[in-house]
């Protein structure tokens, strides 16, 4: 059943669900700061456009009575609980800044008819793809699978002359929320990644991963994993690695690679890091002083969620259109708006597009260097370093299957 | 976090969750009638034992604000919502008569630390197995898999001389809640059934099922499905069926086979029906006049849940033991109590044991006849009709794989 909305003439509210369970362990006050900073910008933009309206946020907190709080694994019902709370309090805004946890978001769409727009800083899983009123402002798993397939197939670059069609995936179940769903998408037999590969095996134990590094009978030279360099080191340590092994370390929301004076440790030499180009505008922001490089992206997604709300409000108000209609609920997609850090593009399904960056460790300088970028909007790889100083033979990425001659 | 309990000296309450989403489409007033009838019996039994205490039920209704109500597929969070409602109202009883929907029950255990006993008339899925404070009063999927494996392996009966190790499973996603989880358990690669079979294939389309009936290249002669004869007829119609096909129709909660003057339709001749021996004591009960043969079992489970609560109350009070302890919460298992219809046995994990009955259609009388019974408590098959008048050749069940000679 529907909830009445605080979305009247001249007064527009965004309901922000402040969940005990979150995709990133971010203090709720930081999220609140990001939202408030976003509101200030939106108010300015609306005033600048001659729209004299009031814009506010209502923060809806969990009561903590029931849920095991903490990570997203026990978050399934928390979003619905808050929706009930909003419903009882008659405090639904024009838009819901919803859960970041995939389970929670999925459940809200499963159990209710959501006829108002929901913006999420997370909801990474494939089960949240193609939701007609959902907008996701951090790269969802589908975008990762498209990059990987594109990269696997690429065979016309100076440093990658082989198409790949095989992979190991390391997934031990202790991953962060983003990694959990990224790896789930790679594991899922129905996913694009699985569909396009001729061989894929999930390694679940540390020992399986460690054994593959020097196993002459391995079925692939490529291992995809997700986490930061420290996570890899705990697993790999200083073990010897066969020369044609390539580890792809997915670490999208981590700006540390771009910080000054960062040197790549020796254990990263066989590793390509997939990340995103950093947003540096938050560095001096009032609410971001205490943010880690990872959390910066999460806070930025909340801030951009508010700016998106403002953008849509401005568009509809300027066109004299009603905000509480299905048209508004379905409009948060297939557009570009001005985010805090520059233009933000949403695809046809409301998912953020971004520039992914593949880094390698230069054997000369021990620095992370950009090998290529990938624009998720056009599904296109753009080589950057045509003569990388790789650890791999001839400074080229090896084939994914080693030719061992007659056996 | 924990909820205070209405479970004091001399006054004991059972909290009954009255869900919009239910395993069987049963009007809530019928459930309430069953509970109230059970309470009358419990009060009598306690008074008879010289225990002058008050026993009541508090019925907790969903507010219907959020959930898509109806079947169990959108029930995940409803149990938790009611638990929150109980928590806010400070109305938790000694025991929770909980959700019948698997999703809902599973979620309650996933998201909370349930330290009080929960009784369910349903929660059929494997994901609700082995919950330390959960009691299930309708046969869960695990029990079905144990019967099927036992029956497949049996090869020393006059009418079954072959061990089977293959099966098709028909599962099109429109099944009732009990069937949905029974078939899920057969499909699951980790289940006992899958583990013990050398070949198993799930048929998801009507046409796949229909084609198998006469397919010379089929990999198994045995098809397991779940539903009533009408469901089978819609699927199979009057199509010809190869003579060595055996359809196992799981229809546990349906007493119609045992009613007087029931004749088996012709399309049931290749079918073995797995059901349970009927509880006829409900037929004249005040609350069961309007119950269908299926719903009788559901109402009976609620009634028996109340009787189990009474049994445990009596046991602990007579022993001078505290009711609001972990010991009480973990005690609803590995016992036999007097149900409405006779003794009810719970296994080590709190799941009801029953006598399953395998019926065949007599080609002579066109009546359903008992072929064998299976006691889930001891995992034992007991043949009943040693000379069944089967449709199958030599009145014996065929091998599961037809020997086609040299190909």
């Amino acid at each position: 059943s529907q909830v009445s909305q605080n979305c009247h003439n001249g007064s527009y509210e965004i309901s922000v669900l402040m969940m005990d369970n979150s995709a990133f362990a971010e203090p709720l006050e930081n999220v609140e700061d990001a939202v408030n900073e976003g509101l200030e910008i939106v108010r300015g933009r609306l005033q600048n456009a001659g729209l004299n309206v009031t814009v506010n946020a209502s923060f809806m907190y969990s009561d903590g009575l029931i849920h095991n709080s903490g990570d997203c694994r026990s978050s399934t019902c928390e979003g619905l609980d808050l929706l009930r709370k909003i419903s009882n309090a008659k405090r639904m805004g024009c838009v819901l800044m919803g859960p970041s946890c995939t389970y929670s978001t999925f459940q809200m769409y499963l159990d209710t008819e959501l006829s108002y727009p929901m913006i999420s800083a997370g909801s990474f899983g494939l089960s949240c793809d193609y939701k007609e009123t959902l907008t996701r402002l951090m790269s969802p798993a589908r975008k990762l699978t498209y990059f990987l397939v594109n990269f696997w197939k690429t065979n016309d670059l100076p440093f990658k002359t082989y198409s790949w069609s095989t992979s190991y995936v390391y997934k031990n179940g202790t991953e962060s929320e983003d990694c959990f769903w990224y790896l789930n998408a790679l594991e899922a037999s129905v996913s694009y990644f699985s569909h396009e590969l001729s061989f894929k095996l999930v390694l679940r134990q540390d020992k399986e991963f460690q054994d593959i590094l020097m196993d002459h009978n391995r079925k692939s030279n490529v291992i995809v994993m997700c986490g930061d360099p420290q996570f890899l080191y705990k697993l790999k340590g200083d073990r010897a690695v066969a020369e044609d092994i390539v580890i792809i370390l997915v670490d999208l929301f981590n700006d540390q690679y771009f910080e000054d004076n960062v040197t790549a440790p020796d254990y990263m030499k066989n590793v390509l890091v997939l990340t995103q180009s950093p947003g540096n505008s938050l560095l001096n922001s009032s609410f971001s002083r205490n943010l880690s490089p990872t959390k910066r992206d999460f806070a930025l997604a909340y801030l951009n969620g508010i700016l998106l709300f403002g953008h849509m409000l401005k568009t509809f108000l300027e066109n004299g259109e009603n905000i509480t209609t299905p048209k508004f609920a379905h409009a948060f997609r297939n557009l570009t708006f001005e985010g805090y850090d520059g233009p933000v593009t949403l695809d046809d399904w409301g998912d953020v597009d971004s520039t992914m960056v593949l880094l390698y460790t230069s054997v000369d300088t021990k620095k992370y260097k950009v090998l290529l970028t990938y624009d998720t909007h056009v599904n296109q790889t753009n080589p950057v370093d045509m003569s990388p100083t790789f650890t791999w033979k001839n400074s080229k990425l090896p084939n994914d299957i080693t030719d061992r001659g007659p056996q | 976090s924990q909820v205070s309990q209405n479970c004091h000296n001399g006054s004991y309450e059972i909290s009954v969750l009255m869900m919009d989403n239910s395993a069987f489409a049963e009007p809530l007033e019928n459930v309430e009638d069953a509970v109230n009838e059970g309470l009358e019996i419990v009060r009598g039994r306690l008074q008879n034992a010289g225990l002058n205490v008050t026993v009541n039920a508090s019925f907790m209704y969903s507010d219907g604000l959020i959930h898509n109500s109806g079947d169990c597929r959108s029930s995940t969070c409803e149990g938790l919502d009611l638990l929150r409602k109980i928590s806010n109202a400070k109305r938790m009883g000694c025991v929770l008569m909980g959700p019948s929907c698997t999703y809902s029950t599973f979620q309650m255990y996933l998201d909370t630390e349930l330290s009080y006993p929960m009784i369910s008339a349903g929660s059929f899925g494997l994901s609700c197995d082995y919950k330390e404070t959960l009691t299930r009063l309708m046969s869960p999927a695990r029990k079905l898999t144990y019967f099927l494996v036992n029956f497949w392996k049996t090869n020393d009966l006059p009418f079954k001389t072959y061990s089977w190790s293959t099966s098709y499973v028909y599962k099109n996603g429109t099944e009732s809640e009990d069937c949905f989880w029974y078939l899920n358990a057969l499909e699951a690669s980790v289940s006992y059934f899958s583990h013990e079979l050398s070949f198993k294939l799930v048929l998801r389309q009507d046409k796949e099922f229909q084609d198998i009936l006469m397919d010379h290249n089929r990999k198994s002669n045995v098809i397991v499905m779940c539903g009533d004869p009408q469901f089978l007829y819609k699927l199979k119609g009057d199509r010809a069926v190869a003579e060595d096909i055996v359809i196992i129709l799981v229809d546990l909660f349906n007493d119609q086979y045992f009613e007087d003057n029931v004749t088996a339709p012709d399309y049931m001749k290749n079918v073995l029906v797995l059901t349970q021996s009927p509880g006829n004591s409900l037929l004249n009960s005040s609350f069961s006049r309007n119950l269908s043969p299926t719903k009788r079992d559901f109402a009976l489970a609620y009634l028996n849940g109340i009787l189990l609560f009474g049994h445990m109350l009596k046991t602990f009070l007579e022993n001078g033991e505290n009711i609001t302890t972990p010991k009480f919460a973990h005690a609803f298992r590995n016992l036999t109590f007097e149900g409405y219809d006779g003794p009810v046995t719970l296994d080590d994990w709190g799941d009801v044991d029953s006598t399953m009955v395998l019926l065949y259609t007599s080609v002579d009388t066109k009546k359903y006849k008992v072929l064998l019974t299976y006691d889930t408590h001891v995992n034992q098959t007991n043949p009943v009709d040693m000379s069944p008048t089967f449709t199958w050749k030599n009145s014996k069940l065929p091998n599961d794989i037809t020997d086609r000679g040299p190909q």
Partner: antibody, heavy 119, light 107 residues
């Protein structure tokens, strides 16, 4: 108080490349778009294009193929290059700051640089 | 692009009188319109944004109105320092475009 200070060559020959730089003092650089606007002698204002601290640009299509706007955040500076100039490009060139990020109107202006294109 | 047309090209007004300047857009710009004042040899100065909101430090005698395609800048009582060229500018879309200007001169 925010101040914009601009400099660059004032006299160019046709076909040369105009090059101007604008430095920002006394305010945040990252929260704004920074524009170039020109005004031919005795005429009205023409917006050339804009850039933010990340290098995202929007240009006037009438000039686009000739315009390059760049940014150096380490120095809080942005620059304009206009290639293949002709006498029609003679104007006072202003750098300006939007009143707020993407606001599209300009509350702080440089002092202006007269660029003359003459053979 | 959106073409901005100002009228009149020149407006002669006596000090202390009211001046009314018009600006028309070739298509709707909602209220995304700004007004600037420019004196000889100086950079333009922002007066009004959002069609009617005065920028910081702008006297109350300056007021803006209108929406869509028709806009007006009114100077309530002209002071000697108000004689200048006034430009309207739309910022609804890119490219940002200015009107050709109205020169307010002493009558």
């Amino acid at each position: 108080q925010v101040q914009l200070q601009q400099w660059g060559a004032g006299l160019l020959k046709p076909s040369e490349t105009l090059s101007l730089t604008c430095a920002v003092f006394g305010g945040s650089f990252s929260g704004y778009y920074w524009s170039w606007i020109r005004q031919p002698p005795g005429k009205g204002l023409e917006w050339i294009g804009e850039i933010n601290h990340r290098g995202n640009t929007n240009d006037n299509p009438s000039l686009k193929s000739r315009v390059t706007i760049s940014v150096d955040t380490s120095k809080n500076q942005f620059a304009l290059k206009l290639s293949s100039v002709t006498a029609a490009d003679t104007a006072v060139y202003y750098c300006a700051r939007e009143r707020g990020y993407t606001y599209g109107n300009f509350d702080h202006w440089g002092q202006g640089t007269l660029v003359t294109v003459s053979s | 692009e959106i073409v901005m047309t100002q009228s009149p090209a020149t407006l002669s007004v006596s000090p202390g009188e009211r001046a009314t300047l018009s600006c028309r857009a070739s298509q709707s710009v909602s209220r995304n319109l700004a007004w600037y004042q420019q004196k000889p040899g100086q950079a333009p100065r922002l007066l009004i944004y959002g069609a009617s909101t005065r920028a910081t430090g702008i006297p109350a005698r300056f007021s803006g109105s209108g929406s869509g395609t028709e806009f007006t800048l009114t100077i309530g009582s002209l002071q000697s320092e108000d004689f200048a060229v006034y430009y309207c500018q739309q910022y609804k879309t890119w490219p940002r475009t200015f009107g050709q200007g109205t020169n307010v001169e002493i009558k």
